[in-house]
């Protein structure tokens, strides 16, 4: 988790003085709890936003915007802590909006802005925005929260972000899976434009079943650049097992911007489908 | 134009099953979360449903969880929702709704719905 660029982040607007800092995620009203506290934010939104940096490459962040209730609780508000939570690793980055001056009613409902958080794709957060200074102990919360799921690299608006192109995401192999005679299976995929090595990795499975009956790994060397953006094709031995009949073919990719965790395209082919006829019934029932 | 058209609504008995559907025109809609929200008479808006841009996450109300069902088809612009063992206090008007944001939140909508359908009435009584 980190803040888009360093460059000077503002919060202030007209009738407001406000400067963001960076914050522990542990504000000092939690240590010394105060008389009177702030309502909660209203109308928690978040969107995915994208922004480039100042060298050009462009992120998904997540836009957060909040209101404030029109109640007299924000001549208390001091201001009010933004915490963003990556749900898989438990990592928190936090700042806090300072107010310089204090907060009036006026004709407009107050709403805030912040579009500096960095996320990462197919990751799911917990967007959280605290009013500050945060309640006493006992005192009615005064936060709002929502889980973020980020779209992962195949969403199209995602497909052309710096992390998602640099995990391969604009490749597009168009996989193809054929089943030939003798136990064999004739996989073809589009090269890349890039000299790196590929894995082919099949797993086969029963007909209803998740557990595999077979798995076979196969390396492509680095195709030279007249081969690339060509069909490449392989024949693929499959084990002579009755009913081990679905086959499930990954193409892993070793591009140089991703090295071993490039993302992976997959093509599964299923078993064929089984007549309806019964089994023939013998004329004769064999007495041994 | 962004459109959302319902249908699939009608009078059903108590225990039966009724599928909606929702087609959906003028955005990309493979980006998007969508929704259902139903209201019920004289009641205020519910939540009911919501399904990622690609199905990968789902998430219901309490209320229909176990008996309700959401789903897409990208390629047709299409979303979903299987009703099955429908009760009298699922009697309302469903509408279909767009996620204003990319991104889903669970629980219902990260911003706001920006457009909706018309509504299709779901009655559901003996």
């Known amino acids: 988790l980190r803040l888009l660029d360093h460059r000077a982040l503002v919060c202030s607007q007209p009738g407001l003085n406000c400067t963001v800092k960076n914050s522990t995620c542990l504000d000092d009203s939690w240590i010394h709890p105060r008389n009177l506290t702030p309502s909660s934010p209203k109308d928690l939104q978040i969107q995915l936003h994208f922004a480039h940096t100042q060298q050009g490459d462009l992120f998904p962040v997540a836009h957060i915007e909040w209101t404030l209730q029109t109640d007299a609780s924000i001549l208390y508000l001091e201001g009010a802590e933004l915490s963003v939570l990556q749900l898989n690793t438990n990592e928190r980055l936090c700042v806090r909006f300072e107010f310089l001056s204090k907060l009036r009613h006026h004709h407009r409902r107050w709403r805030f802005t912040f579009s500096h958080f960095v996320v990462d794709p197919d990751q799911e957060y917990e967007v959280t925005v605290h009013h500050l200074p945060k309640p006493i102990p006992d005192g009615d919360p005064n936060h709002q929260s929502k889980n973020f799921l980020v779209p992962d690299c195949e969403h199209a608006r995602m497909k052309v972000t710096t992390p998602c192109m640099s995990s391969g995401s604009l490749w597009d192999p168009n996989i193809t899976v054929e089943t030939l005679e003798a136990h064999q299976l004739r996989v073809s995929f589009t090269l890349w434009n890039e000299s790196t090595h590929y894995q082919i990795l099949l797993t086969s499975f029963p007909h209803m079943e998740n557990h595999s009956c077979f798995e076979h790994m196969h390396h492509i060397p680095a195709p030279r650049p007249e081969e690339f953006h060509q069909r490449s094709n392989v024949t693929l031995t499959l084990r002579n097992l009755k009913g081990c009949c679905r086959h499930q073919v990954q193409i892993q990719p070793f591009f140089s911007s991703c090295l071993n965790d490039c993302l992976r395209h997959s093509a599964t082919v299923s078993c064929p489908e089984m007549p309806d006829t019964p089994e023939p019934i013998p004329d004769y029932m064999p007495l041994w | 134009e962004v459109q959302l058209v319902e249908s699939g609504g009608g009078l059903v008995q108590p225990g039966r099953s009724l599928r909606l559907s929702c087609a959906a025109s003028?955005?990309?809609?493979?980006?998007?979360?969508m929704h259902w929200v139903r209201q019920a008479p004289g009641k205020g808006l519910e939540w009911v449903s919501g399904i990622s841009w690609n199905s990968g996450r789902i998430d219901y109300a309490d209320s229909v969880k176990g008996r309700f069902t959401i789903s897409r088809d990208n390629a047709k612009n299409s979303l979903y929702l299987q009703m099955n063992s429908l009760r009298a206090e699922d009697t309302a008007l469903y509408y279909c709704?767009?996620?204003?944001?990319?991104?889903?939140?669970?629980?219902?909508?990260?911003?706001?719905?920006?457009?909706w359908g018309q509504g299709t009435l779901v009655t559901v009584s003996s």
């Open positions: 709704a767009k996620d204003m944001g990319l991104g889903y939140c669970s629980g219902g909508s990260c911003s706001h719905f920006d457009h």
């Open positions: 003028g955005f990309p809609f493979d980006d998007y979360a």
